[in-house]
């Protein structure tokens, strides 16, 4: 029995930041779980982990240097990635594992989300000029 995961097909990170919501066919309330976000077609880079335990505060961490935060819903985890680089444009996959209570459950591989990181504009656009000097 596998959990199903839904993700947006594509997101654009305009300010080098993005919210990626992973929606599950499973209620995480009062479960011990490990939700993770993986980068690349082969999911080789684990970008961020959200660990939840019915008796402890939510833990959010990255072992790979990403600036991430996480929010928990009953049937979703939202990853908030900041300080993304243009070269981190890639496909990102949500993964969920329920460790307790038994049995262990994980998800069918999702279709993933392409995150397109747009570079920051370092000078004002001609259409939106900055404030004029007095």
């Amino acid at each position: 029995n596998k959990i199903l995961v839904k993700q947006s097909p594509m997101l654009v990170a305009y300010d080098n930041a993005v919210n990626l919501s992973c929606k599950y066919s499973y209620n995480l309330f009062s479960r011990e779980f490990r939700a993770s976000l993986h980068k690349g077609l082969d999911s080789a880079v684990e970008v961020c982990v959200v660990y939840g335990n019915y008796s402890q505060q939510l833990q959010v961490y990255s072992k790979t240097g990403f600036n991430c935060d996480g929010k928990l819903g009953n049937e979703s985890v939202t990853f908030y990635l900041q300080n993304l680089y243009v070269n981190q444009t890639d496909i990102y996959f949500c993964k969920i594992e329920v460790m307790y209570p038994p049995p262990y459950l994980d998800n069918e591989k999702s279709n993933g989300t392409i995150i397109h990181v747009k570079g920051k504009h370092l000078c004002p656009s001609p259409l939106f000029p900055g404030p004029s000097k007095p």
Partner: antibody, heavy 121, light 107 residues
Framework: QVQLQQPGSELMRPGASVKLSCKAS????????MHWVKQRHGQGLEWIGN????????IYDEKFKSKATLTVDTSSSTAYMHLSSLTSEDSAVFYC??????????????WGQGTSVTVSS | DIQVNQSPSSLSASLGDTITITCHAS??????LNWYQQKPGNIPKLLIY???NLHTGVPSRFSGSGSGTGFTLTISSLQPEDIATYYC?????????FGGGTKLEIK
């Protein structure tokens, strides 16, 4: 309290194989990785690999891939390491030790007493 | 694989001294470094996790610092019971790897 119980010693012949056991108690077996660590007499610690009892997922150091096979029996909360084609190089103490699977507390916090394997003809 | 180089390999110090042991990782491991103590004839015991966090029950004279590739274990006011071999271990990526160990002796 958390306990990882291992047999004290095994005396084996060269070429034989051995299955070491590690019985866990006092915690949720499926919330932790089980690792195996080798220590030859008077030497340092070498990480062999680990297994996640929930899914059976295993990770090995390349050096030990053809030597060690890790398995678990969740019904008895026991982890096993099978060592094949034993040589004198396999004479060592083998420890089982756990680390949390989900949280950022990612260190080996409880250790078994170790099984001393002696390979001798 | 990430290599972890530990120095010195042995160290002799007097009771009451402050000593430092260093570990250098071959690539950035952020804060994912742990320290273990192994007393003669005993099993390894976790001292510090995630570079600077003292494990439960470990005396406050032990401290850890560092991030990226350079890490330090400091023992202040050395006690007789601190005679042991100390190991660092990186947990940033698999395979996990240990430093070669530092054998601490009392002068």
């Amino acid at each position: 309290q958390v306990q990882l119980q291992q047999p004290g010693s095994e005396l084996m012949r060269p070429g034989a194989s051995v299955k070491l056991s590690c019985k866990a108690s006092g915690y949720t077996f499926t919330s932790y990785w089980m690792h195996w660590v080798k220590q030859r007499h008077g030497q340092g610690l070498e990480w062999i690999g680990n297994i996640y009892p929930g899914s059976g997922r295993t990770i090995y150091d390349e050096k030990f891939k053809s030597k060690a096979t890790l398995t678990v029996d969740t019904s008895s909360s026991t982890a096993y390491m099978h060592l094949s084609s034993l040589t004198s190089e396999d004479s060592a103490v083998f420890y089982c030790t756990r680390s949390h699977y989900g949280s950022s507390f990612d260190a080996m916090d409880y250790w078994g007493q170790g099984t001393s394997v002696t390979v001798s003809s | 694989d990430i290599q972890v180089n530990q120095s010195p390999s042995s160290l002799s110090a007097s009771l009451g001294d402050t000593i430092t042991i260093t570990c250098h990782a071959s690539q950035n491991i952020y804060v994912w470094l742990n320290w273990y103590q192994q007393k003669p004839g005993n099993i390894p015991k976790l001292l510090i996790y995630k570079a600077s966090n003292l494990h439960t029950g470990v005396p406050s004279r032990f401290s850890g610092s560092g991030s990226g590739t350079g890490f330090t274990l400091t023992i202040s006011s050395l006690q007789p019971e601190d005679i042991a071999t100390y190991y660092c271990q990186q947990g940033q990526s698999y395979p996990w790897t240990f430093g070669g160990g530092t054998k601490l002796e009392i002068k």
